[in-house]
């Protein structure tokens, strides 16, 4: 006869491991007992369980409540056992010793591998600001056994670097994603992808990029200077900019206070029916936590009774 087992049994942490040991004997041969022991190199054998043809299953105290026979129907030549709720410390070499009649004793070894699936974590780097050089966008760490694979999935152009730390029974892998921040990256997903044999599918953690920036400011509304004449209603100036975080707007008049009746509504400055007192230099001040910008325009309200048109100057400053 001969023993049938597996060289390696692989199980995921927390699952039950079936340790196979089947005696393929000639007709008339009987199995008296099957003794299971853990036999890691450098350590003495540690008894696990005994399957006895008469006495039944005995589980050694160290494994009490964790070793069972597979459910019926059972073949008397089958010495397989179930190791319940496998933990990382169970990883190692196991031996089954089969005592048969009349053929004598046989033994076989197998290796139990306990896969520890990773629980990845993603940590965003420092705040990203337009104009910075190569900057850490995020780091992703996953620890498992064996070492997990950590990669990145993104449309954003960048560079990655990985490092690994080996522990006694596992390995931690950290991958960093660096980029040169630009406003086009704002709102783009950066996904950490973790692969591991203990996972049914890759684990993915997505981070949305936020890049701080503030565009140049400009003022719209004076494109046709002839519209700015005494008595005109509904005249307005609009300050144009964009940024992350979204900017706030403030209007001032360089050569004095804002005239009465002039309404400030965020990025818009609304005028009452125009009079000559509305002529002057107006400044739009745009700011966010990252930066601030100014744009100024000169308003010259025309008197339709005067023949000569007046020029309007637009000046932008930051």
């Amino acid at each position: 006869g001969e023993l049938e087992t597996s060289d390696v049994v692989t199980v995921v942490l927390g699952q039950d491991a079936k340790l196979p040991c089947f005696y393929r004997g000639d007709s008339g041969e009987q199995v008296g007992q099957v003794a299971w022991a853990r036999v890691d190199a450098g350590e003495g054998a540690q008894e696990l369980a005994l399957l006895h043809s008469k006495y039944g299953l005995h589980v050694s105290p160290a494994y009490e409540g964790r070793v069972e026979q597979p459910p019926p129907p059972r073949n008397p030549l089958d010495g397989s056992v179930l190791l319940r709720n496998a933990v990382q410390a169970d990883e190692g070499e196991y031996e089954c010793r089969v005592s048969t009649f009349p053929a004598g004793s046989f033994q076989a070894r197998l290796r139990l591998r306990v896969l520890v699936p990773p629980l990845p974590s993603l940590n965003p780097g420092p705040a990203l600001e337009e104009g910075q050089g190569l900057t850490l966008a995020a780091s992703c760490t996953a620890e498992g056994s064996p070492a997990p694979s950590v990669t990145w999935d993104t449309e954003v152009k960048g560079t990655t670097s990985s490092r690994s730390f080996k522990h006694s029974r596992s390995a931690a892998v950290t991958s960093e994603f660096h980029l040169v921040p630009s406003r086009s990256m704002n709102g783009q997903p950066l996904t950490c992808v973790v692969s591991h044999p203990g996972l049914l599918q890759d684990q993915r953690i997505t981070h949305i990029l936020h890049v701080s920036f503030l565009a140049e400011a400009s003022v719209r509304g004076l494109e046709d200077q002839n519209l700015w004449h005494i008595g005109r209603e509904g005249a307005m100036l609009k300050c144009l900019s964009e940024g992350q975080p979204p900017p706030s707007y403030n209007w001032t008049r360089l050569d004095g206070p804002l005239p009465s009746g002039v309404r400030v509504d965020g990025d818009t400055l609304g005028f009452p029916p125009l009079t000559t007192e509305h002529s002057g230099i107006y400044v739009c001040h745009v700011s966010n936590e990252f930066s601030s910008r100014d744009s100024q325009v000169t308003v010259d309200v025309l008197d339709p009774q005067e023949d000569s048109g007046k020029q309007v100057d637009l000046v932008s400053a930051s």
Epitope: Q33, H52, H58
Partner: antibody, heavy 126, light 107 residues
Framework: EVQLVESGGGLVQPGGSLRLSCAAS????????MSWVRQAPGKGLEWVSG????????RYADSVKGRFTISRDNSKNTLYLQMNSLRAEDTAVYYC???????????????????WGQGTLVTVSS | DIQMTQSPSSLSASVGDRVTITCRAS??????LAWYQQKPGKAPKLLIY???SLQSGVPSRFSGSGSGTDFTLTISSLQPEDFATYYC?????????FGQGTKVEIK
């Protein structure tokens, strides 16, 4: 025919010592695990100690741990029980017994006691 | 330690009676259970091992059953030489432990 014969019992004062012997014959002594079991007068059976056939694996009941020592000399087919620091509650008939040999090379379990000696009485009294 | 509880502690019966003694373990012991017979002034004698296997030379009127925690020794037809004290013993763990005994007396 399997025979187990105990000797060495007797009267001893509390705190004293005794060494029991068990001479085995009629079978291959070093193929079998052995045990000592005692029975106080009018009481039930209590397992005292056991020793495996070849290994140095020895086990003791909590009540005698640290005071009693089991040993065997396979060349003399003899089992021993060294009893020190004896107490009144150790008074009993001490039996040596052979363990049934149908479990092979597995120390975590003991087996039934298929042959017993006639017993030797140990009396601890002042 | 595993506790073994026998019942009854004693019983009176007549020759020819069917006698049943039960033994309960405080935890599961598979079939790691033996039954012994002891007569006054004599050493115990193994009757049944592995809960239900008859030891060589023991009359077939003795039988055992059970596994796990509950076990039974049955004497199908009591004979005069069967009046004795009977003990169950578990050998699943060390220390092996005995029941307190059941004394079978003549009615």
């Amino acid at each position: 025919e399997v025979q187990l014969v105990e000797s060495g019992g007797g009267l001893v004062q509390p705190g004293g010592s005794l060494r029991l012997s068990c001479a085995a014959s009629g079978y291959t002594f070093d193929d079998y695990d052995m045990s000592w079991v005692r029975q106080a007068p009018g009481k039930g059976l209590e397992w005292v100690s056991g020793i495996k056939a070849h290994s140095d694996n020895k086990r003791y009941a909590d009540s005698v741990k640290g005071r009693f020592t089991i040993s065997r000399d396979n060349s003399k087919n003899t089992l021993y029980l060294q009893m020190n620091s004896l107490r009144a509650e150790d008074t009993a008939v001490y039996y040596c017994a052979r363990e049934y040999s149908d479990v092979v090379d597995y120390v975590s379990v003991r087996t039934p006691l298929d042959y017993w000696g006639q017993g030797t009485l140990v009396t601890v009294s002042s | 330690d595993i506790q073994m509880t026998q019942s009854p502690s004693s019983l009176s019966a007549s020759v020819g009676d069917r006698v049943t003694i039960t033994c309960r373990a405080s935890q599961g012991i598979s079939s790691y259970l033996a039954w012994y017979q002891q007569k006054p002034g004599k050493a115990p004698k193994l009757l049944i091992y592995a809960a239900s296997s008859l030891q060589s030379g023991v009359p077939s009127r003795f039988s055992g059953s059970g596994s796990g925690t509950d076990f039974t020794l049955t004497i199908s037809s009591l004979q005069p030489e069967d009046f004795a004290t009977y003990y169950c013993q578990q050998h699943y763990t060390t220390p092996p432990t005995f029941g307190q005994g059941t004394k079978v007396e003549i009615k």
